[in-house]
C-alpha cells in the first residue's frame, strides 16, 4: 500500500481467483484513543472499533472511503483504491490502446517545436467518475523539472455504438534548451482513477522524436505565363522554432484531386516556393517536416487550384 | 576551416556534408525510428557518447559570440562516431548488409571532421569507451542505439552549419 495523495491510498493486488489479497492496517488521524468506530462509504454498519482497523483487501467491495468516527463526529477519512496486477502485468482497463505507432500505446505526445512545450493525449470510453493527474520530468534518476497543467476533456467522438473521450494535457520543460541534443528522455506519468480503480500509464520520449510542425501558412498561387504551371509559395508556421536558418524545415508539395486514387503532381523542396502543375478541381497541398531529423510530417495546408 | 587559432570553417561545404550525413544516418537505419530502444535497458552503453549540450555554444547566439566552442564539440563527436563506426561493433558479426550505407557514413564523418580540423592542428578528442558486446544480438542492439544517437547528433551539427552558412559566412 502507498499514499497517492493525502488520505488516498493505493492497494496493489495480485488479481486471480481466490487470491489472498492484502492485509491493510488503517490508523485514525486523531489524538483520541477510545470510543472510535469505523464505517465504509455511506454504510452505517460498524466495521470495527479502536484507533486502528485491520482489513483484508481482496476485491473492489473492500475498497472505498473508510471513515473513523467518535460520538457521531467524523475524525478522518482514508480512501482505498485498488491497482490490479494480472499475470504479472498491471491492468490497463481505463485507457484505450491507440495502437499507434505500436501496440500498447496509451499516451501519445506531440510537440510543435523545440521550445520544450508538448501536448499528450489519451482515449477512454469511460464518461463518469474519472480523474487524471499528470507528472513529468526530464530523466528519471536525477529528474529535471517539467510542469504540466490539468488534464482536460478535449474531444468527444462516436465510434460505432460507443462514445470515445479524448483527454489532453500541456506540459512545459522548465529550463528547455532548444538547440541542444537531448541525452535524457522526457518521462510522462499519468495516474488514472475510475471509481475505486487506480491505474498508471507512462511514456518516455525525446522532444525531437515527437516533433510535428504545424502546417505551412499563407499559401499563395501565382500562375506562370504561357504554361500550365503555377508557382505556389508559403511561409513557415508561426509556431515553429526560430531562427529558421537554424531550425529549418523541408516541404512536400502535392497537387491532387479529391480522391487519393487520382493522379497527382508531387515535388519536395527546402525552399518556401515551388512550381507545380495545377488541374481543374484539384488542390495544391503543402506539408512540412524537420529538415535534419525525420520526425512526423505536418498536416497538409491546402488551396484550390482554381 | 575551423582551426584552434579561431579562423572560420568553410561553412557552406560543412553545411552540404552535414546534410549528407543526416540523409546517410537515416538511410543507415530508417527503421530505428520505429523501435523504442529505451525499452531494451542497457542505457549506459550510449550514455558515454558526446552530446551537444546547452553550454556548448551551438545555439544561434553562441555561434555568433564564438563558434569555436561549438565547432570543437562537433569535431569531438565526429571523431568519436567515426571511431565507433570503424570498431568491431560495426565490423563484427552479424555482418552488415553489403548495401548498408554505414561505410559511406563512416567516410563522411571523417570527411567533415577533416574539414573542421586540417592536418597539423589538434583539438583534444574524447576517449572511446570500451564497448565490446559479446553476443551478436547485443552488437546489433548497440548498432541501433549508436545510429539513433548519431541521427540526433548530426541533426544538431547540420543546423549549426546551415545557420553558419546563412549568417556567418564571409
Amino acid at each position: 500500500i502507498w499514499e497517492l495523495k493525502k488520505d488516498v491510498y493505493v492497494v496493489e493486488l495480485d488479481w486471480y481467483p481466490d487470491a489472498p489479497g492484502e492485509m491493510v492496517v488503517l490508523t485514525c488521524d486523531t489524538p483520541e484513543e477510545d470510543g472510535i468506530t469505523w464505517t465504509l462509504d455511506q454504510s452505517s454498519e460498524v466495521l470495527g472499533s479502536g484507533k486502528t482497523l485491520t482489513i483484508q483487501v481482496k476485491e473492489f467491495g473492500d475498497a472505498g472511503q473508510y471513515t473513523c468516527h467518535k460520538g457521531g463526529e467524523v475524525l478522518s477519512h482514508s480512501l482505498l483504491l485498488l491497482h490490479k496486477k494480472e499475470d504479472g502485468i498491471w491492468s490497463t482497463d481505463i485507457l484505450k490502446d491507440q495502437k499507434e505507432p505500436k501496440n500498447k500505446t496509451f499516451l501519445r505526445c506531440e510537440a510543435k517545436n523545440y521550445s520544450g512545450r508538448f501536448t499528450c493525449w489519451w482515449l477512454t470510453t469511460i464518461s463518469t467518475d474519472l480523474t487524471f493527474s499528470v507528472k513529468s520530468s526530464r530523466g528519471s534518476s536525477d529528474p529535471q523539472g517539467v510542469t504540466c497543467g490539468a488534464a482536460t476533456l478535449s474531444a468527444e467522438r462516436v465510434r460505432g455504438d460507443n462514445k470515445e473521450y479524448e483527454y489532453s494535457v500541456e506540459c512545459q520543460e522548465d529550463s528547455a534548451c532548444p538547440a541542444a541534443e537531448e541525452s535524457l528522455p522526457i518521462e510522462v506519468m499519468v495516474d488514472a482513477v475510475h471509481k475505486l480503480k487506480y491505474e498508471n500509464y507512462t511514456s518516455s520520449f525525446f522532444i525531437r522524436d515527437i516533433i510535428k510542425p504545424d502546417p505551412p501558412k499563407n499559401l499563395q498561387l501565382k500562375p506562370l505565363k504561357n504554361s500550365r504551371q503555377v508557382e505556389v509559395s508559403w511561409e513557415y508556421p508561426d509556431t515553429w522554432s526560430t531562427p529558421h536558418s537554424y531550425f529549418s524545415l523541408t516541404f512536400c508539395v502535392q497537387v491532387q484531386g479529391k480522391s487519393k486514387r487520382e493522379k497527382k503532381d508531387r515535388v519536395f523542396t527546402d525552399k518556401t516556393s515551388a512550381t507545380v502543375i495545377c488541374r481543374k478541381n484539384a488542390s495544391i497541398s503543402v506539408r512540412a517536416q524537420d529538415r535534419y531529423y525525420s520526425s512526423s510530417w505536418s498536416e497538409w495546408a491546402s488551396v484550390p487550384c482554381s | 576551416r575551423a582551426v584552434p587559432g579561431g579562423s572560420s570553417p568553410a561553412w557552406t561545404q560543412c553545411q552540404q556534408l552535414s546534410q549528407k550525413l543526416c540523409t546517410l544516418a537515416w538511410s543507415a537505419h530508417p527503421l530505428v525510428g520505429h523501435m523504442d530502444l529505451r525499452e531494451e535497458g542497457d542505457e549506459e552503453t550510449t550514455n558515454d557518447v558526446p552530446h551537444i549540450q546547452c553550454g556548448d555554444g551551438c545555439d544561434p547566439q553562441g555561434l555568433r559570440d564564438n563558434s569555436q566552442f561549438c565547432l570543437q564539440r562537433i569535431h569531438q563527436g565526429l571523431i568519436f562516431y567515426e571511431k565507433l563506426l570503424g570498431s568491431d561493433i560495426f565490423t563484427g558479426e552479424p555482418s552488415l548488409l553489403p548495401d548498408s550505407p554505414v561505410g559511406q557514413l563512416h567516410a563522411s564523418l571523417l570527411g567533415l571532421s577533416q574539414l573542421l580540423q586540417p592536418e597539423g592542428h589538434h583539438w583534444e578528442t574524447q576517449q572511446i569507451p570500451s564497448l565490446s558486446p559479446s553476443q551478436p544480438w547485443q552488437r546489433l542492439l548497440l548498432r541501433f542505439k549508436i545510429l539513433r544517437s548519431l541521427q540526433a547528433f548530426v541533426a544538431v551539427a547540420a543546423r549549426v552549419f546551415a545557420h553558419g552558412a546563412a549568417t556567418l559566412s564571409p
Epitope: 504551371q229 512550381t275 488541374r279 | -
Partner: antibody, heavy 118, light 107 residues
Framework: QVQLVQSGAEVKKPGASVKVSCKAS????????LHWVRQAPGQGLEWMGW????????EYAPKFQGRVTMTTDTSTSTAYMELRSLRSDDTAVYYC???????????WGQGTMVTVSS | EIVMTQSPATLSVSPGERATLSCRAP??????LHWYQQKPGQAPRLLIY???QSISGIPARFSGSGSGTEFTLTISSLQSEDFAVYYC?????????FGGGTKVEIK
C-alpha cells in the same frame, strides 16, 4: 495489368512528319498522365513532354516546343505524338509511358523506332 | 534546364560484387531524383523513386540514397541480370532531364 502498346517502326524523309500511337489497357485511361521520351541510337533518354488525357493539357520540353503535338483519343484509350519538320537527328526510339505521378515514369511502352533518312 | 551528371560512364564489376553508381545535380533538387534500368533492346524500368523509395517487384539489392546534389544507387550483390545501363532523372523542375547513364558491365 497496365500495358502500353505502340505502333510499328517508321521511316521518314527529312522535313516530313511522323505520328506515333500508344494504346493503353489495364486501367482507366484518364487516370494516368502520359509522357513521351525518346532515345537516339546509342544515346541517353530525352523527355519530350506530357499530356493529361482527362483534359488534354500538355507541357512540352522547350526543345520540342512548336514542333511536337501530343493528343489523346479517350474513346480508344490511345495517345498520339506527332513530330513535324523531321531532321536526321530525330532518328530515335520513341517511348510512351504512363504514371499516376506526373514527374517520373512507371509503365513504358515497347518503343517505336523512327528513322529519318533521305 | 538541370543537367544531371552520372559517374562513372562505365563500371566493370564481377558478379556478386557491390556496385555504387553516382548521380550529381548542379543545384539542390531535394529528393526529386529517380533511377531506371535499361537492358539492350528493352524499354527502361523504374527502380527507385524520390531518391530512396523502393518499388514493389524490384529486388531488395537495389537501394538509393542521397538528397540535395549527390545521389547514389547501390546494387549490393550484382546478379547476371543486373548488367545494364542505369539512368537517373530529376523531377525538381521542368523540363524533366536524365543523366547520361552508367553502363554496368561484367568484369
Amino acid at each position: 495489368q497496365v500495358q502500353l502498346v505502340q505502333s510499328g517502326a517508321e521511316v521518314k524523309k527529312p522535313g516530313a512528319s511522323v505520328k506515333v500511337s500508344c494504346k493503353a489497357s489495364g486501367y482507366t485511361f484518364t487516370d494516368y498522365y502520359l509522357h513521351w521520351v525518346r532515345q537516339a541510337p546509342g544515346q541517353g533518354l530525352e523527355w519530350m513532354g506530357w499530356i493529361d488525357p482527362e483534359n488534354g493539357d500538355t507541357e512540352y520540353a522547350p526543345k520540342f516546343q512548336g514542333r511536337v503535338t501530343m493528343t489523346t483519343d479517350t474513346s480508344t484509350s490511345t495517345a498520339y505524338m506527332e513530330l513535324r519538320s523531321l531532321r536526321s537527328d530525330d532518328t530515335a526510339v520513341y517511348y510512351c509511358n504512363a504514371n499516376k505521378e506526373l514527374r517520373y515514369f512507371d509503365v513504358w511502352g515497347q518503343g517505336t523506332m523512327v528513322t529519318v533518312s533521305s | 534546364e538541370i543537367v544531371m551528371t552520372q559517374s562513372p560512364a562505365t563500371l566493370s564489376v564481377s558478379p556478386g560484387e557491390r556496385a555504387t553508381l553516382s548521380c550529381r545535380a548542379p543545384q539542390s533538387i531535394s529528393i526529386n531524383l529517380h533511377w531506371y534500368q535499361q537492358k539492350p533492346g528493352q524499354a527502361p524500368r523504374l527502380l527507385i523513386y524520390f531518391a530512396s523509395q523502393s518499388i514493389s517487384g524490384i529486388p531488395a539489392r537495389f537501394s538509393g540514397s542521397g538528397s540535395g546534389t549527390e545521389f547514389t544507387l547501390t546494387i549490393s550483390s550484382l546478379q547476371s541480370e543486373d548488367f545494364a545501363v542505369y539512368y537517373c532523372q530529376q523531377s525538381n523542375s521542368f523540363p524533366l532531364t536524365f543523366g547520361g547513364g552508367t553502363k554496368v558491365e561484367i568484369k
